[in-house]
């Protein structure tokens, strides 16, 4: 039975040209996290594997940095980076947990962080 929940940074906004940290946290389970995949809509951005460490997709290497922790840092943001991001936690023995983050990249200098929210 899957008892865990993923807490994410939720709906967030950031300035064009700036950086943002995408962060998810798995709680309420003793399951072992074996791998975390980060996806942007239909693109694989990066993978963090318990044994192999990080793999950043080559097409994102210039603008994506691993961490902190199991999170992901996006740099040199453009308006095209606006959209949904997913953290997919592969765990044993529970299975797969998915968290969603919506990022809005703003032209203006006013970029406020949204509230945290949970996905069961």
């Amino acid at each position: 039975m899957m008892t865990g929940t993923i807490e994410t940074t939720g709906n967030i906004s950031a300035e064009k040209g700036g950086s943002i940290i995408l962060q998810c946290h798995l709680s309420s389970t003793t399951a072992q996290v074996t791998q975390v995949n980060w996806e942007q809509q239909d693109q694989l951005l990066a993978i963090c594997n318990a044994d192999l460490g990080w793999h950043i997709s080559p097409s994102f290497k210039d603008r994506v940095a691993p961490g902190p922790g199991l999170g992901l840092t996006l740099q040199s943001l453009t308006v095209n980076d606006t959209g949904e991001y997913f953290c997919i936690y592969h765990t044993y023995p529970d299975g797969t947990y998915t968290g969603r983050i919506f990022l809005e990249v703003l032209e203006s200098s006013v970029a406020e962080h949204g509230a945290r929210f949970q996905i069961p």
Epitope: D42, Q43, N49, D51, L52, S57
Partner: antibody
């Protein structure tokens, strides 16, 4: 240099058993998921089974479920495929392949031929 | 199970030609799509992983694109050593499945 070397293939009668081995070298075997993929004569590729690294979770194609068992011995850097109740349609070249991040298969062995015939 | 449909099943081309092979998944697989090349009597060789990432050591004339359900492998300028069979494969979910293959032959 990464190397995968399959062995254990041969001729076996229908209903018989065979155990394939894949000896790995040149990388930290225990850190990688591993797969068996087969190819019947003149046909395409068919994934048979996979085993993850951290969890050791095992996955099978429906066509072999209940008959084949994938396993690994990390101390011997070896992957196995135990094949029971073999059928004529299991005749194929069997490849072992390394599966980093369980997303792609980057290194393959040279294959071992299994022929099931009376 | 996710079905992978490759087209065409075979094609004839000349050295220097631009060749495009397509692969369609029966459901969305994000970018969990890989391309392999196989020559007769040899093991498959990884060309492209995660839809568009070029495997180390593979010539840059090979490229991959697509996401969701529709994917493409392109060889920008076909070389003599590229005549082979090409397979797509999804790793979105088990059972892992391959396309039926595309045989690239000399015209």
């Amino acid at each position: 240099e990464v190397q995968l070397l399959e062995s254990g293939g041969g001729l076996v009668q229908p209903g018989g058993s065979l155990r394939l081995s894949c000896a790995a070298s040149g990388f930290t075997f225990s850190s990688y998921g591993m797969n068996w993929v087969r190819q019947a004569p003149g046909k395409g590729l068919e994934w048979v089974a996979g085993i993850k690294s951290s969890s050791g979770n095992k996955y099978y194609a429906d066509s072999v479920k209940g008959r084949f068992t994938i396993s690994r011995d990390n101390s011997k850097n070896t992957l196995y495929l135990q094949m029971n109740s073999l059928r004529a349609e299991d005749t194929a070249v069997y490849y072992c392949a390394r599966g980093p991040y369980d997303v792609w298969m980057d290194y393959w062995g040279q294959g071992t031929l299994v022929t099931v015939s009376s | 199970d996710i079905q992978m449909t490759q087209s065409p099943s075979s094609l004839s081309a000349s050295v220097g030609d631009r060749v495009t092979i397509t692969c369609r998944a029966s459901q969305s697989i994000s970018s969990y799509l890989n391309w392999y090349q196989q020559k007769p009597g040899k093991a498959p060789k990884l060309l492209i992983y995660a839809a568009s990432s070029l495997q180390s050591g593979v010539p840059s004339r090979f490229s991959g694109s697509g996401s969701g359900t529709d994917f493409t492998l392109t060889i920008s300028s076909l070389q003599p050593e590229d005549f082979a069979t090409y397979y797509c494969q999804q790793s979105y979910s088990t059972p892992l499945t391959f396309g039926g293959g595309t045989k690239v032959e000399i015209k």
